[in-house]
């Protein structure tokens, strides 16, 4: 059977797949999954290897017709080095030179100028090409080799590995060589697999359930270090509560150099986030630090000095945290609109079972707006996710220039922001820059502002204005309004209505669907159209909502089913990647981010049209 | 790189008082296991008693109820106390720790020390 990281190559016109019948002729047959001589894989950024053969596909010469043949693996070599050209085109790195079968009544492939259809390449049973199923670095634990990448093939006892092995232990733990030739270099490392006994690389904190690897005799980048992490499903360490630190700098204490951990400020216009998304509330900075020094963008827990943290630049090698294991912050559940009817007083709005209200005319010391908020019933909003964030933004009348007080604090225990309602801690969106808490005066309160509504630490003491927010009461069954300009069950936001399609749907199902009711998938043309379709969606159960986005038309290039440019985006980490398909909203912690899925998956999704009786303002021009 | 080092043996009657083993590991290792072994003259090596870095214990048939492994993380040390001891207990014992270390070799073994259980 093929591993997920093993492909057949496929020629389209003639057929057939790449058959390495030895190392020195590399041919094509029909192609046969079963067969070992036409199993391949990527071995490295640029090397493809023969599975049978444990040889990676090469060139004597980097010049027109020679035959590829198969050589030992050597990631220095320039003749081993290929990449994928416009679509399906496999190449010699460097050179208009390409992977051909066919030309010359010539049985072996060649390396040939011409980059017509006998250079095109896929992988068998799929429409992608070689390099979408490209290779993955695995970071190394523990070993003698720092951490470093399994280099595979690796030999070992003059027999070559192309995966992870357990030869020469009795103990079934995984490990592979970090260089070509263990038995030369002796150098290796643990692979990031589960295995029998790969518990014991953990340490679990018996109050909490939650497990932590520290690894300090690694030396990885930041992003590095991340990746290590998620290779065992978890997560660069977030720290949240005190007892967390604690736990931590006890485990740590015999450790002398710095340990990366999850804290960065890594997104261009949002401040300090935790990498798991785990909310920013508890601080415990080295004094100077956070310095405001460009590039700093990553911070490391410093062992040595009572494990309190310091920013650093992201390309410094160190040891690092992981964490997997329960978090506390599910334990809080934010109903989701659709679940909660809500009434709200005249002048508040109503959101997931809850009523807000912008003050922004009387401005306020926080303590005298927090009694103001009490006294009508509510408190300083506290907020929980994005969507109510996003909500407060696109619908509450929040403008650009704001600067409001929200309830977020750290008065009663210093370093430790909770909210003034008591509701827990569950998220946070930092300006860029924040919390800076200044030393020089007391930054104990939260604002929000900036066209964004992200959130600074203030001093207490300025007038400003403020968000209150109050539990609604429910009156029953709901009134359901119909907006001006939109038809029932539809939602009017600025020149649009919105419709929710709640049968679960492929792309294109979603997309007629919506045709038929005069509309058209949703486009998303700012931040600000964004922030509501999330709040719109954010907190359904469902994973995925279609947008009108795909690259169906133009492998690579992203377009709306209607003709509209694309001028926003609001990708997820790791998207749109090389994958082609079709684009959803997700929900929950990643509410509102891009994802591309496979167009015929089913999904809920969006539609929306213009609103009856709303001018057509100018389209914008380039 | 790894050293293991046992100490205890000798003389013993038998039935006579307890014989405690100790097999210390020379460096700190993140070790899965310890294990005594034996090996009695003109026989196989055979395990006698396993101790995995979790606690899980695992004892031969013939030494059941009368041997007891036990550690101690602190002095990186794992003990063999053999009570009720029989003349066929005789034989080289070897201490055997699966570690994970600085190379992909998991097994070490002591140098053995001798018991002899005779009257």
């Known amino acids: 059977l093929l591993d997920t990281r093993q492909f057949l190559i496929y020629n389209e016109d003639h057929k057939r797949c790449v058959d390495a019948v030895s190392p020195s002729a590399v041919q094509t047959a029909a192609c046969n999954q079963d067969a070992e001589s036409q199993k391949f894989r990527w071995v490295s950024e640029s090397q493809i290897m023969s599975v049978a053969f444990k040889l990676c596909l090469g060139v004597p010469s980097k010049t027109d017709w020679v035959a590829i043949t198969l050589y030992a693996c050597d990631s220095k070599s320039e003749f081993q080095k290929w990449e994928c050209k416009n679509d399906t085109l496999l190449g010699i790195k460097g050179e208009d030179l390409f992977f051909n079968y066919g030309n010359r009544q010539e049985k072996n492939i060649m390396l040939y100028k011409g980059s017509g259809l006998w250079s095109r390449w896929k992988i068998y049973g799929t429409t992608d090409n070689l390099c979408s199923r490209g290779y993955e670095a695995m970071y190394t634990l523990l070993g003698n080799a720092n951490g470093a990448t399994c280099a595979f093939p690796f030999k070992f006892e003059n027999k070559w590995y192309a995966d992870c092995t357990s030869a020469g232990r009795s103990d079934g733990w995984l490990w592979c060589g970090t260089t070509t030739d263990y038995d030369t270099d002796k150098l290796f490392g643990y692979c990031p697999l589960k295995f029998e006994g790969s518990e014991s690389l953990w340490n679990k904190d018996p109050l909490t359930s939650v497990s932590y690897q520290i690894n300090s005799k690694s030396a990885l980048t930041w992003h590095q270090a991340r990746k290590s992490c998620q290779q065992q499903n978890a997560e660069l360490l977030s720290i949240t509560e005190i007892h967390e630190q604690t736990y931590l700098t006890g485990l740590t204490s015999s450790l002398t150099s710095g340990l990366w951990i999850g804290l960065n400020s890594l997104s261009f216009n949002s401040g300090w986030q935790w990498s798991d998304r785990s909310p920013f509330r508890y601080l415990n900075w080295l004094p100077g630090s956070p310095s405001a020094e460009p590039g700093k963008s990553c911070v490391s827990l410093n062992p040595g000095k009572n494990a309190k943290w310091e920013n650093l630049e992201c390309v410094q090698k160190l040891g690092y945290i992981c964490k997997k294991g329960n978090t506390t912050l599910n334990s809080f559940v934010i109903p989701s609109e659709s679940d909660v009817p809500t009434h709200c007083p005249s002048q508040w709005w109503p959101y997931a079972g809850h009523c807000y209200k912008i003050h922004r005319d009387e401005k306020k010391i926080q303590r005298d707006a927090l009694t103001t908020c009490r006294k009508e019933g509510g408190d300083l909003t506290s907020i929980h996710t994005i969507e109510e964030l996003d909500f407060i933004i696109s619908q509450l009348g929040y403008e650009p220039n704001d600067e409001l007080w929200i309830g977020l604090n750290d008065i009663k225990i210093q370093m430790y922001f909770e909210w003034s309602d008591g509701t827990p801690v569950t998220f946070t969106k930092w300006l860029r820059g924040e919390p800076s808490h200044e030393n020089n005066r007391q930054e104990d309160c939260v604002v929000m502002k900036g066209k964004d509504g992200y959130w600074a630490d203030r001093g207490c003491e300025w007038p400003l204005g403020y968000i209150c927010k109050m539990k609604s009461r429910s009156q029953g069954p709901e009134i359901v309004e119909v907006e001006k300009g939109c038809r029932k069950g539809w939602k009017k936001h600025h020149f649009y209505c919105y419709m929710i399609g709640h049968t679960l749907s492929t792309f294109a199902e979603a997309n007629q669907t919506c045709n038929n009711e005069n509309a058209y998938l949703t486009t998303i043309e700012d931040r600000y159209e964004q922030a509501f379709l999330t709040s719109f969606v954010g907190l359904r159960p469902e994973k995925y909502f279609w947008t009108g986005l795909s690259d169906i038309q133009t492998k690579g290039t992203f377009q709306w089913t209607i003709e509209e440019e694309v001028r926003f985006t609001h990708w997820n980490s790791d998207m749109p990647g090389r994958k082609p398909g079709c684009v959803a909203m997700r929900t929950g912690i990643a509410g509102g981010l891009w994802d591309v899925l496979k167009c015929d998956e089913k999904a809920k999704f969006v539609c929306k049209h213009w609103a009856e009786g709303v001018t057509h303002p100018p389209k914008p021009t380039t | 790189d790894v050293q293991l080092v046992e100490s205890g043996g000798g003389l013993v009657q038998p039935g006579g008082v307890s014989e405690t083993l100790l097999c210390s590991l020379w460096k700190h290792l993140h070790y899965q296991c310890h294990g005594w072994y034996r090996q009695a003259p003109g026989k196989q090596r055979e395990e006698v008693a396993a101790?995995?870095?979790?606690?899980?214990?695992n004892y031969a048939d013939s030494v059941k109820g009368r041997f007891t492994i036990s550690r101690d993380n602190a002095k990186n040390t794992v003990y063999l106390q053999m009570n009720s001891l029989k003349p066929e207990d005789t034989a080289v014992y070897y201490c055997?720790?699966?570690?994970?270390?600085?190379?992909?070799?998991?097994?070490?073994w002591g140098q053995g020390t001798l018991v002899t259980v005779s009257s």
């Open positions: 101790i995995t870095s979790g606690g899980s214990t």
């Open positions: 055997k720790a699966v570690v994970v270390t600085t190379t992909p070799y998991s097994d070490y």
